[in-house]
């Protein structure tokens, strides 16, 4: 990640800026926590403080947005369920996967149901 400039250029009293384009929130250290977002409008630039939550994985953060299917059925063997996400929008310079798979543990209730189904199938 390129280091952002600390100075803030502001237009003179008569300057008007209709549309600011804001870049991503870039954490000051590592890949989460407090950082800065840089905005540009014409020749002006501004930096504002922002925060990237540390429980977000980078690929699921603001850089890459996905549209997710519903969760699949619980896999009794692994105790997990899966859903697929298709890329909806990426930050211009973010090299996002076109599709991603997310897994999560089944709830105890779904686990029990999946086991019961498995048991019935064996009979």
């Amino acid at each position: 990640v390129a280091k952002k400039k600390d100075k803030v250029k502001k237009g003179g009293p008569g300057s008007e800026c209709a549309e600011w384009a804001w870049g991503p929130c870039t954490p000051s250290s590592k890949d989460c926590g407090v950082g800065f977002r840089e905005g540009t409008c014409g020749a002006q630039t501004q930096r504002i403080r922002c925060r990237v939550p540390c429980n977000w994985k980078k690929e699921f953060g603001a850089d890459c947005k996905y549209k997710f299917e519903n969760w699949g059925a619980c896999d009794g063997g692994t105790g997990t369920k899966v859903r697929q996400g298709t890329l909806k929008k990426a930050r211009y310079n973010a090299q996002c996967q076109e599709t991603i798979r997310v897994t999560k543990p089944c709830t105890p209730k779904t686990k029990a149901k999946a086991k019961a189904k498995k048991g019935k199938g064996k009979d």
Partner: antibody
Framework: QVQLQQPGAELVRPGHSVKLSCKAS????????MNWVRQRPGQGLEWIGM????????ILNQKFKDKATLTVDISSNTAYMQLSSPTSEDSAVYFC??????????WGQGTTLTVSS | EIVLTQSPATLSLSPGERANLSCRAS??????LHWYQQKPHQAPRLLIK???QSISGIPARFSGSGPGTDFNLTISSVEPEDFAVYYC?????????FGGGTKLEIK
């Protein structure tokens, strides 16, 4: 792979606005930024602006803020650029291109716009 | 806006020679620099993205270097089909800007 189709040529009278189209086929149109680029005869490339079909977020080169309006129609997988009050200065080839930082980009063949009475 | 200066404006080489094209940015743009090839009456074609990342379907003789302010596109051994105009483009900040181009011509 994305294919982008643009009309080969458009003729418009000075002062009459014109809407250029860019129709996408192939992979998902709505996931990628659509750029518009101008190339005047014998000149280099000039970025006009871009739009994201998923939410119509638009970033426009300030130089074109009073000239170009970018829109998309998701139902027909088509991006549009409307040029207001065209003059002979706007006679150029206009390209659209679909950008993905991961895979690169795909370009239309360009529309030659002639502004003439 | 970020200004990209390409040099030389024209490069005259014979097939088989090595080509070095330069692109200098007016400020640091990290690795957000891309190279395009354009032939007459055709759309530009992406050769290299993010300073040095190769593109599927582009011959291995094309390579790029960066990041920072000074970038280079190298064609290790020029082929007859490589004679064209080459543009660099930055995507570090809006507006996106292109260099003025380098014309690679047959000597």
């Amino acid at each position: 792979q994305v294919q982008l189709q643009q009309p080969g040529a458009e003729l418009v009278r000075p002062g009459h606005s014109v809407k250029l189209s860019c129709k996408a086929s192939g992979q998902s149109f709505s996931s990628y930024w659509m750029n518009w680029v101008r190339q005047r005869p014998g000149q280099g490339l000039e970025w006009i602006g871009m739009i994201h079909p998923s939410d119509s977020e638009t970033i426009l080169n300030q130089k074109f803020k009073d000239k170009a309006t970018l829109t998309v129609d998701i139902s027909s997988n088509t991006a549009y650029m409307q040029l207001s009050s065209p003059t002979s200065e706007d006679s150029a080839v206009y390209f659209c291109s679909s950008w993905s930082a991961k895979r690169g980009d795909f370009w239309g063949q360009g529309t030659t716009l002639t502004v003439s009475s | 806006e970020i200004v990209l200066t390409q040099s030389p404006a024209t490069l005259s080489l014979s097939p088989g020679e090595r080509a070095n094209l330069s692109c200098r940015a007016s400020e640091s743009i990290s690795n957000n620099l891309h190279w395009y090839q354009q032939k007459p009456h055709q759309a530009p074609r992406l050769l290299i993205k993010y300073a040095s990342q190769s593109i599927s379907g582009i011959p291995a003789r094309f390579s790029g270097s960066g990041p920072g302010t000074d970038f280079n596109l190298t064609i290790s051994s020029v082929e007859p089909e490589d004679f064209a105009v080459y543009y660099c483009q930055q995507s570090n900040s809006w507006p996106l800007t292109f260099g003025g181009g380098t014309k690679l011509e047959i000597k």
